[in-house]
Amino acid sequence: EVEKTACPSGKKAPEIDESLIFYKKWELEACVDAALLATQMDRVNAIPFTYEQLDVLKHKLDELYPQGYPESVIQHLGYLFLKMSPEDIRKWNVTSLETLKALLEVNKGHEMSPQVATLIDRFVKGRGQLDKDTLDTLTAFYPGYLCSLSPEELSSVPPSSIWAVRPQDLDTCDPRQLDVLYPKARLAFQNMNGSEYFVKIQSFLGGAPTEDLKALSQQNVSMDLATFMKLRTDAVLPLTVAEVQKLLGPHVEGLKAEERHRPVRDWILRQRQDDLDTLGLGLQG
């Protein structure tokens, strides 16, 4: 806590500018008006303040806004955002996507910090659901964002938002998460034609039930092995050899290299040897 000291004569800051970098911490505390700082927050980023000086500026804003900063200030926090604690952020009410983008930009290139996680949580809760524009923004900054949500949180994602999801956004999702996302994707893409539909739905198929895989097998989709290996074992097991052959097309040749891995291993054990032999790969059930 910086002591309250009078501002020396002639040192009162008429505006936020570069001259302030020469102020000692106590001078900043005494000579910078908090209301002025709040209105000129956009200038702070352009000035090479030390971390100690930024601490003083944060302290002044905290005193001015004990209930939490207004969005007009939050949007221009810049690097001062890195000084905020999750407790500080929980007091905020961030509703503008532009504000969210501005703060995410500050943390760009780093892993998601507790501060960012709190900010996103506040923002999404404020909006009531994870809409397409928000999801677009979040996955652009954090490709693994979607897979960091619990199945319960994912249930608030409207099907329309699924259009914003890229295949790489689902790389780290587990089956429970895909179980939630797959029906939404199916709904979102339902009006697309066969081949276009498959391209879009492919990365969500880890949540697909057997009947949907059987339906896909009738559509000449040629699913690659990487996708097949991510399917739910319980969804793959009931598929016949003929259905798997149709589902994979030329990719069926890759089953041999995967014969010891799930779900291929478990599926092989469920099949009649005569049927497996038709694949021409020497698979042993």
Epitope: D224, L225, Q245, P250, H251, E253, G254, K256, A257, D277, T278, L279, G280, L281, G282
Partner: antibody, heavy 121, light 107 residues
């Protein structure tokens, strides 16, 4: 040991068809798909397609879909490739090759010696 | 389809020297690349698979490296019998594709 035997040469006239053979021995024929590869004079290798010898199901490189027809005769462990409507562009060496399925879709560990096809009037 | 761009198309080197050939895939092929030596009148001979795994009986003068889209193949201590054309093959996709080939000559 594994062997893929192909006739050395075939000479055919433009517009005709030819059926190239590849006789496999030294392994269970129906446990490995058979692939075909083309090499034009002074050019590189080009994958034509493959066939499941167990059920006779072929897959083609789109470029050869209307040119090549792949078949097998399980009783003689022989794979065939018929080339139709022959032109000078089809003059090439054609190889059959067997994949090894150690990883992914398999690389070719055994090759035939190749059949040199000459299309000329 | 995955395109494989191989370079150079030809090269000349001295006996005992070292040469390096590169293949660039049009997309990530997860190290699923093999290298072949091809001499006239014969079928191609497998040298290396899975980027750097040497086939049994192939001398350690031959080596491979790479990941993602970029791969290389080297021969050190060049010998007269190394005169041949060399090809890369991607097998990350069932529709296999070869590089254009590199013709190796000895100075």
């Amino acid at each position: 040991q594994v062997q893929l035997q192909q006739p050395g040469t075939e000479l055919v006239k433009p517009g005709a068809s030819v059926k190239l053979s590849c006789k496999a021995s030294g392994y269970t024929f129906t446990n490995y798909w058979m692939h075909w590869v083309k090499q034009r004079p002074g050019q590189g290798l080009e994958w034509i397609g493959n066939i499941n010898p167990s059920n006779g199901g072929p897959y083609y490189n789109e470029r050869f879909r209307s040119k090549a027809t792949l078949t097998v005769d399980k009783s003689s462990s022989t794979a065939y490739m018929q080339l139709s409507s022959l032109t000078s562009e089809d003059s090439a060496v054609y190889y059959c090759a067997r994949p090894y399925y150690g990883s992914s879709y398999g690389y070719f560990d055994y090759w035939g010696q190749g059949t040199t096809l000459t299309v000329s009037s | 389809d995955i395109q494989m761009t191989q370079s150079p198309s030809s090269l000349s080197a001295s006996l005992g020297g070292k040469v390096t050939i590169t293949c660039k895939a049009s997309q990530d092929i997860n190290k699923y690349i093999a290298w072949y030596q091809h001499k006239p009148g014969k079928g191609p001979r497998l040298l290396i698979h899975y980027t750097s795994e040497l086939q049994p009986g192939i001398p350690s003068r031959f080596s491979g490296n790479g990941s993602g889209r970029d791969y290389s193949f080297s021969i050190s201590n060049l010998e007269p019998e190394d005169i041949a054309t060399y090809y890369c093959l991607q097998y990350a996709n069932p529709l296999r594709t070869f590089g254009g080939g590199t013709k190796l000559e000895i100075k």
